[in-house]
C-alpha cells in the first residue's frame, strides 16, 4: 500500500475509563494531511460517530471509556499529498484501580506516573489529562493513599497539586480524579502517581541538569551524517538513566530495523561535587521525516530536545 | 529496612477464635496493600485476602469469606488477620506479604505464625 | 479462577545440572502477572522471579524465567546445592490469587 510504518514500541497503560490517544509525526502533521485510524490490522477505519464508544475525533482515537477487550495494536494512516505513513501503537488495558485492589493493577509504572517532590521547598504534582477538545474536564480532585487530600499545605491549580514545604510524609500513592463530559455524559478519569521525596541538597538538588541540548534547532543539511551530546550533571550517588527518546520511544529501539539513528556509549567525568555524563545521538544520515521531529534527551525527570531545520537557502548562491 | 513482625506460635482450641498480628516498620505502612496467606503443614500456600491500610479496603478469596476478618491499626502500624470457628483444617502457618504500587508481587513476607488448633 | 499447574511435583538434579520445571495456567495470563518464590523448609516464601523473568534482589543469575500465555518455566543453568528448596509459581492478575502446588527441587 506503499505507506511506512512507524512502529511505536512503548505501550500505554491504561485503567477502565476515558482515554485518547493523538496521531501526531512532525513534520508530517503540521501540513495538509488526512488521519485515519486503524485497530489490529482492520481494513475497516475507526468509526467517526462521537455517539460510538470507540471513534475517531480529528486525529485523536478516543475510548469512552476503555475496555478490557480494548487492548492491542491500533494504527493511524497519514496520507499527505504525496506521502502516506502508518503510525504503530500497542495499547494495554488494565482493569483495576490501585484503591479498589493491588490485583492486577499496573506494573512496571511509565515515567508519567512517577513524580518527585523536593523536601523542604514547595513543589507540585501535574495530572497528565491528554483529550482531545471535544471532552470537557471538570476540576481535579487529589487523593493520597486513597483518601482524598485536604489541608492548608495543598492547593488544587488547573492540573496541579501544590504542595507546600514538602515533608518526607508526603511521598506515597496518589491519584488525580476528574469527571471529563462529552456529549453530554460523564465519566471519570482517576490516574495513579507514585510520588517520592527527594532529600539530596547537593550539586543542585537531585534533580538532574541537562547543560546541553536547550529545547533548540539545528540546522543540517540533508544526507549528512550528525553527532549531537547530551552533556547532564547530576550527584555522584544517582541513579538516573540518561537516554535519547523520540516519539516517546528509545532511539535504538524506534530505528531497531533501519539503525540510521542510535544512541552512543555514555561517559562521564568526575567532579568533586558531582558527575558529567555525556550520551550522544548518532544520525547516520540525516532524512527527511528527522525534521521536525522532537529528538528528547532524558535524564531522570529532566528533558530536553533538538529539532533539525534544513538551512535556509542561501540566496547568494542565485 | 523493610520488616513483618508477626506473632509467635499459637495453640487453640477447636470452635474458638484467634487473632495474628504483623506489625510493619521501615516503609509507610499506609501506602501499601497488605495480604494473608496460609499454608498449611507440607502443602502448598492459598491466599486469604488483602486490606489496605488507610481506607480499610478489604478484597478476600470467597473460601475465607466467614473465616477470616482483615483489620488494621494504622497508629501501630500493624494489620491484623482474624480467624473465627477454628477447626482442625485451620491449622496452617499464616503469613502476611506486602505490595507496592507498580510492583503486582510478594515482595516482602513476614515469618509466618504457626497456628495449631487442638483439643 | 485461575489453576496453576506445576510440573513435576518432586525432581532432583546433581551439582552443575541444568534444571527446568514448569507451570501451566488454566487460562491466559500476563507475563508482568506471573511470579516464582523459593521456599526452604522452616522459612517463609521468597520473591525469586518477578513478571515471567526478572530476577529477585540477590537471586544469582543461574536463574532465568521465560514463556507467556499458559506456559511459563524456571530454568537453573547449573544446579547448586543451595538451590535446594520449595518453587511455587504465583499469578497476580485476577481474584483470587493463586499459587502452584510448587516444584520440590533435591540435591541427587
Known amino acids: 500500500d506503499g505507506c511506512k510504518d512507524i512502529f511505536m514500541k512503548n505501550e500505554i497503560l491504561s485503567a477502565s475509563q476515558p482515554f485518547a490517544f493523538n496521531c501526531t509525526f512532525p513534520p508530517i502533521t503540521s501540513g495538509e494531511v488526512s488521519v485515519t485510524w486503524y485497530k489490529n490490522s482492520s481494513k475497516i477505519p475507526v468509526s467517526k460517530i462521537i455517539q460510538s464508544r470507540i471513534h475517531q475525533d480529528e486525529t485523536w482515537i478516543l475510548f469512552l471509556p476503555m475496555e478490557w477487550g480494548d487492548s492491542g495494536v491500533y494504527q493511524c494512516v497519514i496520507k499527505g499529498r504525496d506521502s502516506c505513513h502508518r503510525i504503530h501503537v500497542n495499547l494495554t488495558v488494565f482493569e483495576k484501580h490501585w484503591c479498589d485492589t493491588s490485583i492486577g493493577g499496573l506494573p512496571n509504572l511509565s515515567d508519567e506516573y512517577k513524580q518527585i517532590l523536593h523536601l523542604g521547598k514547595d513543589d507540585s504534582l501535574t495530572c497528565h489529562l491528554h483529550f482531545p477538545k471535544s471532552c470537557v474536564l471538570g476540576p481535579i480532585k487529589w487523593y493520597k493513599d486513597c483518601n482524598e487530600i485536604k489541608g492548608e499545605r495543598f492547593t488544587v491549580l488547573e492540573t496541579r497539586l501544590l504542595v507546600s514545604n514538602v515533608s518526607a510524609e508526603d511521598r506515597g500513592n496518589y491519584a488525580c480524579q476528574a469527571i471529563l463530559t462529552h456529549s453530554g455524559k460523564q465519566y471519570e478519569v482517576l490516574n495513579g502517581i507514585t510520588v517520592s521525596i527527594t532529600e539530596r541538597a547537593g550539586y543542585g538538588g537531585s534533580v538532574p541538569k541537562i547543560i546541553y541540548p536547550k529545547n533548540h534547532s539545528i540546522e543540517v543539511q540533508l544526507g549528512t551524517t550528525l553527532i549531537v551530546d547530551c552533556n547532564v550533571t547530576d550527584t555522584k550517588d544517582n541513579t538516573n538513566l540518561r537516554c535519547w527518546r523520540v516519539n516517546n520511544t528509545l532511539v535504538d529501539d524506534y530505528y531497531d530495523e533501519s539503525k540510521r539513528i542510535r544512541e552512543g556509549v555514555e561517559t562521564h567525568v568526575s567532579f568533586r561535587e558531582h558527575n558529567l555524563y555525556t550520551v550522544n545521538i548518532t544520525f547516520l544520515e540525516v532524512k527527511m521525516e528527522d525534521y521536525g521531529l522532537p529528538f528528547m534527551c532524558h535524564a531522570g525527570v529532566s528533558t530536553a530536545y533538538i529539532i533539525l531545520q534544513l538551512p535556509a537557502p542561501d540566496f547568494r548562491a542565485y | 529496612q523493610v520488616q513483618l513482625q508477626q506473632t509467635g506460635s499459637v495453640l487453640v482450641r477447636p470452635g474458638t477464635s484467634v487473632k495474628l498480628s504483623c506489625k510493619a516498620s521501615g516503609y509507610t505502612f499506609t501506602s501499601s496493600w497488605m495480604h494473608w496467606a496460609k499454608q498449611r503443614p507440607g502443602q502448598g500456600l492459598e491466599w486469604i485476602g488483602e486490606i489496605h491500610p488507610n481506607s480499610a479496603k478489604t478484597n478476600y478469596n470467597e473460601k475465607f469469606k466467614g473465616k477470616a476478618t482483615l483489620t488494621v491499626d494504622t497508629f501501630s502500624s500493624t494489620a491484623y488477620v482474624d480467624l473465627s470457628s477454628l477447626a482442625s483444617e485451620d491449622s496452617a502457618v499464616y503469613y502476611c506479604a506486602r505490595v507496592d504500587y507498580g510492583k503486582p508481587w510478594f515482595a516482602y513476607w513476614g515469618q509466618g505464625t504457626l497456628v495449631t488448633v487442638s483439643a | 479462577q485461575i489453576v496453576l499447574t506445576q510440573s513435576p511435583t518432586i525432581m532432583s538434579a546433581s551439582p552443575g545440572e541444568r534444571v527446568t520445571m514448569t507451570c501451566s495456567a488454566s487460562?491466559?495470563?500476563?507475563?508482568?502477572?506471573l511470579h516464582w518464590y523459593q521456599q526452604k523448609p522452616g522459612s517463609s516464601p521468597k520473591l525469586w522471579i518477578y513478571s515471567t523473568s526478572n530476577l529477585a534482589s540477590g537471586v544469582p543469575a543461574r536463574f532465568s524465567g521465560s514463556g507467556s500465555g499458559t506456559s511459563y518455566s524456571l530454568t537453573i543453568n547449573s544446579m547448586e546445592a543451595e538451590d535446594a528448596a520449595t518453587y511455587y509459581c504465583q499469578q497476580f492478575q485476577s481474584s483470587p490469587l493463586t499459587f502452584g502446588a510448587g516444584t520440590k527441587l533435591g540435591l541427587k
Open positions: 487460562s491466559s495470563v500476563s507475563s508482568s502477572y
